[in-house]
Amino acid sequence: MASALRPPRVPKPKGVLPSHYYESFLEKKGPCDRDYKKFWAGLQGLTIYFYNSNRDFQHVEKLNLGAFEKLTDEIPWGSSRDPGTHFSLILRDQEIKFKVETLECREMWKGFILTVVELRVPTDLTLLPGHLYMMSEVLAKEEARRALETPSCFLKVSRLEAQLLLERYPECGNLLLRPSGDGADGVSVTTRQMHNGTHVVRHYKVKREGPKYVIDVEQPFSCTSLDAVVNYFVSHTKKALVPFLLDEDYEKVLGYVEADKENGENVWVAPSAPGPGPAPCTGGPKPLSPASSQDKLPPLPPLPNQEENYVTPIGDGPAVDYENQDVASSSWPVILKPKKLPKPPAKLPKPPVGPKPEPKVFNGGLGRKLPVSSAQPLFPTAGLADMTAELQKKLEKRRALEH
C-alpha cells in the first residue's frame, strides 16, 4: 500500500522554501484543465505549493486557500462507490479536484487543509491519534504565523477609499481592515452590508492594547492577532461579512518603487493602462455576491455609542473622534466591468505627512486571509480498521524522521 511518508528528497538549501506542514504527491484538475496533472505538493500557511517533482525546490504553481469554502469527497465519474482517493476543494471563485494515492493520504490532506483554514483540528475525519497530534502541532505553528502577519484584507487606504472599494467591488468581499488614522497601532474595520434594502457602510475601531487587539463593540472583544479580528467579524455575522480578496492574476503584474520627486519618499508605482479600471475579482464560477443575502443575516453586535467613539489622540496628531455611524451608500455610478488592468498596490503612500509602509504583495506565498468555514463533509470510515497498525508504524517512522 502506498504511504503518505515523504519519499527521499534532495535537501533544500536553507532559506529557499519554508518546510511544509504536509506534503505528498497530488493530482490536480482545475476548472480549466481537461485532465488531472500530477505534482508533488506541499501545504505551507494558507498556500498549497505545487512542484514538478519531489526533488524541486521551486514551485511551478500555487493555490491560495484564502477564499476557502468547503471540502467534499468526490466519486469519480462512472464509479458506483467512493474509492476514497478523490476530493474537491471549493473556493469562493473556483473548484479544484484532487486525486491522491490512498484514502489515508486524502484524509491527511483534508485534515491539514481544514486545520489551517479553520484554525482547529478537525474531529470528524478518519484520522489516527498520531495524525491528529501532527495537526495540532501545525495548528500551533499556523496560529503563531498568523499572529505575525497582516491579513490580505488589510489595505493601506483611507476611510473614503475603503468605502469606495467595497461599493465598487462587492463581489470581492464586504469587509476590509485599514489603518486606524489615530496615529496608534490600531486598525479600523470597514464593512458594507444590506440593511432595510439599503447598503450601509460601517466603521469599527480596533485598538491595540499591548499584544492584543481590542474590538470596540458593546462588549469589547479581545483578539491575539489581526487575523482573529477578521475571524470575529466573519463569525459574528454568520459569514455575512466576507474579507475583501483580490484576484490572483494581479500578482503577475510587476510594480516598482520610485522616489517621489516632491519629497523623496518611496512611492509604489504600478504600470498604468488606459480605461476606467480593473475588475479585480474574475475567473472561475462565482457564488452569489456577498451582498445578496446580507439583509437576511444578523448584524454585528451594537456599538457602545452609535453617535461616536472617542479615540485619545497620540502625540501631535489631530484628535479623531472615530465615527461608528452607519453611512448609506446610495450615490454611486453604475460600474462597468472593464478589461483587466495592472493592479495598483495595496499600500499607496500619500504624502506629505508621513511615509507609509512598503508595498504589500496580495497573494504572496504566506500572506492570505480566509473566510472561516464550518462546512464539514461526512467521511466514510469503513475498511480503515485494518490499516491502524500499519499507520501507527508509519507515524512512528515519520516522527523519527522529523526529529
Partner: antibody, heavy 124, light 107 residues
Framework: EVQLLESGGGLVQPGGSLRLSCAAS????????MGWVRQAPGKGLEWVSG????????SYADSVKGRFTISRDNSKNTLYLQMNSLRAEDTAVYYC?????????????????WGQGTLVTVSS | DIQMTQSPSSLSASVGDRVTITCRAS??????LNWYQQKPGKAPKLLIY???SLQSGVPSRFSGSGSGTDFTLTISSLQPEDFATYYC?????????FGQGTKLEIK
Amino acid sequence: EVQLLESGGGLVQPGGSLRLSCAASGFTFSGYSMGWVRQAPGKGLEWVSGISSYYYGTSYADSVKGRFTISRDNSKNTLYLQMNSLRAEDTAVYYCARSWTVGSSWDGDAFDYWGQGTLVTVSS
Amino acid sequence: DIQMTQSPSSLSASVGDRVTITCRASQSISSYLNWYQQKPGKAPKLLIYAASSLQSGVPSRFSGSGSGTDFTLTISSLQPEDFATYYCQQSYWYPLTFGQGTKLEIK
C-alpha cells in the same frame, strides 16, 4: 514642484460635450486620488467627481451623474473629465485637485494642491 | 447628502482682529473636516485638515477646532493677506460637500 494644469474648457452649446484634461507634474501621479471641483461665476465651490488611486474607483455628484465621466491615464500623468449633455448650470471654472490621505495621523482625505482652473461656458 | 452650513456668510474685520468662522454639518462627521482659503481669481488653498491640523506652510495664526457637527476656523490676528473667502468641506462621505463660503472683508 507640484503642478496641475487644466485644459479643454471653452464655449459649448447646451447638449454638447467637452473633455477636460489635467496634466500633473512634480509628484508621482499614480499614487494619489484626484478630483474635479467646480465654481460657477460668483458662487461657491462644488465637488464634481473623484477617482481613487486604488483600482480607479469613481464617485460623482448627483448633479452630474450619468453625464460626466472621470478617468485617468497614469502613463501620461493626466486626469480627465468627459462632460456630455452639458447644461447652462454646468457653466463654471473647473479645478483639478490632488487628494491626499494624511498618512498615519489621519485616515481622511483633503485637496492639498489645485490647478488654476479652466472655464467652461454652456450657452446658446 | 451631508449639508455644510457656514456662518456668517460675510464678515468685516480689521487688521489685528481675532476672527471666528463657524461651519455646521447636517450630521456628525467626526473630525473629517477641511478648511480652504480662496482669493479672487485664484484656486483654493488648503489651510486646515482633520478639523484642527494645520497644513504645512500655513501661518500659525490659523487654527481649527470642533468635532461631530460643529466646527470653527479662527484667525488669531488678521493680516492684510487674510482677506479672502473661506470654505469648509467634509470628507466623511461621498458626495464631498463644501460650505457656501464666508467672505472676509476689510472693515
